[in-house]
Structure formats: structure tokens, C-alpha cells
Amino acid sequence: MMTGTIETTGNISAEKGGSIILQCHLSSTTAQVTQVNWEQQDQLLAICNADLGWHISPSFKDRVAPGPGLGLTLQSLTVNDTGEYFCIYHTYPDGTYTGRIFLEVLESSVAEHGARFQIP
């Protein structure tokens, strides 16, 4: 039975050329986290595997950095980076938990962090 919840950084914004940390946290479950995937739409950005550690997709190596923790840092942001990002927790025995973050990359310097919110 899937009892866990994922807390994410929610809706966030950042400046073009800057960087942003995407963070998710899985709670309310004793399930073992075997892997966390970071995806943008259907593109795999990075994997953090319990045995192997981090793997960054080759096409994102220049602009994606692992961490902090199970989070992901996006660097040298462009307006094209605006969109949905997903953290997918692969766990045993629960299965798959997904958290969603919406990132807006702004031209100006009025970028502000949105509030944190829960995704069941």
C-alpha cells in the first residue's frame, strides 16, 4: 500500500542565466528508496541510484549538477527551461512516487520562490 507523500519546492521561478535547485522529499513511508529519477516532460535528466550514485544524461551534463542530497541543480538557465519537472522515487515495496515542480525562467530580476506544497 502506498502511504507516502512527496513534498516539493512547488512552483518556482528563477532568472535567465542563473541557477535553481529542484528539491523533493518523500515522507510518511518506510519504503526503501532504490532510485530517484529527475525528468522534464518525457526526458530523463538525471538518476540517483542507491548502489551506483548519480548519473547525469549526456545531453544535460553541462548544465545539470547532482544534489544537494537527492535534489538537482539546474545551471545557466534559459527561457526554454521553463516547464514541468518531475522527481520520481522508485521504492520497494511501495513502488513509484511522483512529485511535480513547475519552473518559470524569467528575463528580468523579479524571480521569486513560490510556496512549498504537498503532492499526495
Epitope: A50, D51, L52, H55, H90, G95, T96
Partner: antibody, heavy 119, light 107 residues
């Protein structure tokens, strides 16, 4: 080319033991989680067990927990399934399969090895 | 465990036709459903995963759709090599479970 070759199947009496092997080639074995899946004579597929890339984590279906042990030797590029206290319902074709790097499905399968449990 | 009901269990079609195979889960599995092709003498082939993602090397004549509990595999412009057994499998929670299979035969 990615290849998985199972061996070790055969006829065994109820309560007996058997050890299956799966030899992997054509890819970096130590990077991938691996699974065993079986197919009954009625052609039903059932996930049996899984092991993480480094072997630190093992998972089993309730039907085999406590009786089957999945293991791997990354130096030998080989996956194992040790089966004990075998029952007639364990009769099946046993396949080893590679889990995708993103953990979503099983992207390469072997041809399988047949296990028959009968007195 | 998540139960997967696959239909039809048998399907006869002619080359050139487009067919659909359905899988229904007894509880929501989000988008996490995969489709496999099984042919005698060959190893099982992953076609689609996460509901609609086409596995690398698989022709676009294969497509998947669905979310939650209801999923569909569509095969367009059937060719002789497409006649085979097809299975769906949920990969949302353990134990991973499979549908009962669909045998696609030439009419």
C-alpha cells in the same frame, strides 16, 4: 549486442532445490538492476525477484519469499536464482530480464530455462 | 496486488489493418504500464513503457495511451511480423504484475 542466457533448469521433486544462472553479455552488467520473471504452463507471466545493480537490495514476490534467493556476481556477469522447497506451482519457464536504466520496465530478456517440479 | 485485465485474449486481423489491445488495472497505476511482444524462438521485446513512451528501436506503428486504470496498445498497418503474443505489465508498484496476454493472429 545485449544477450541474456539462462541455464540450470530441469526436473526436480517437490521440496527439492535448483539453482538457475543467467549469463549476461554485450552490456555493462554491473550498471543494471536485474529481475527473474516466470511463465506458467498456462502462459501467465509472474515477476519473481529483483536485485539492484550492486546487489545491495533484493526484492521478492510473496509467493517465493523465504524459498528463493536472487544474487549476482558482477565480476562474472552472472545473475542467479537459488530455489528451495520447490512446489508444483513453481513449474514454469524462468526468464532473466534487465531493468531499464530509468527503472521503468524490462528491456532485454533471455530465452528462458524450464523448471518442472513433479514427483 | 494490482490486478491487470487484458482484452481481448484472442484477436484475428488482416495485414494492413489497425488493431487495439486494452489493459485495465483494478486500481490506479498512474501512467506506469508497459507493453511487450512475445514471439516463438525470440526473446520478449519491450515496445512501450510509462503508458506511451516508445522504446528505442521500436517502430512508431506501435503506440500506447492511457492513464490511471485504462490503457491501450495500438498497432497500425499490420505486417506479417506483428502477429504475435502481446502482454501488458504495470510498473507502478510491487509486485509488478502482467495482463493475461493477447494472441494476435492472421485472419
Amino acid at each position: 549486442e545485449e544477450q541474456l542466457v539462462e541455464s540450470g533448469g530441469g526436473l526436480v521433486k517437490p521440496g527439492g532445490t535448483l539453482k538457475l544462472s543467467c549469463a549476461a553479455s554485450g552490456f555493462t552488467f554491473s550498471t543494471y538492476a536485474m529481475s527473474w520473471v516466470r511463465q506458467s504452463p498456462e502462459k501467465r507471466l509472474e515477476w519473481v525477484a529483483e536485485i539492484s545493480s550492486g546487489g545491495s537490495y533484493t526484492y521478492y514476490s510473496d509467493t517465493v519469499t523465504g524459498r528463493f534467493t536472487i544474487s549476482r556476481d558482477n565480476a562474472k556477469n552472472t545473475l542467479y536464482l537459488e530455489m528451495s522447497s520447490l512446489r508444483s506451482e513453481d513449474t514454469a519457464m524462468y526468464y532473466c530480464a534487465r531493468k531499464t536504466l530509468d527503472y521503468y520496465a524490462l528491456d532485454y530478456w533471455g530465452h528462458g530455462t524450464s523448471v518442472t517440479v513433479s514427483s | 496486488d494490482v490486478q491487470i485485465t487484458q482484452s481481448p485474449s484472442y484477436l484475428a486481423a488482416s495485414p494492413g489493418e489497425t488493431i487495439t489491445i486494452n489493459c485495465r488495472a483494478n486500481k490506479t497505476i498512474s501512467k506506469y504500464l508497459a507493453w511487450y511482444q512475445e514471439k516463438p524462438g525470440k526473446t520478449n521485446k519491450l515496445l512501450i513503457y510509462s503508458g506511451s513512451r516508445l522504446q528505442s528501436g521500436i517502430p512508431s506503428k506501435f503506440s500506447g495511451s492511457g492513464y490511471g486504470t485504462d490503457f491501450t496498445l495500438t498497432i497500425s498497418s499490420l505486417e506479417p511480423e506483428d502477429f504475435a503474443m502481446y502482454y501488458c505489465q504495470q510498473h507502478n508498484e510491487y509486485p509488478w504484475t502482467f495482463g493475461g496476454g493477447t494472441k494476435l493472429e492472421i485472419k
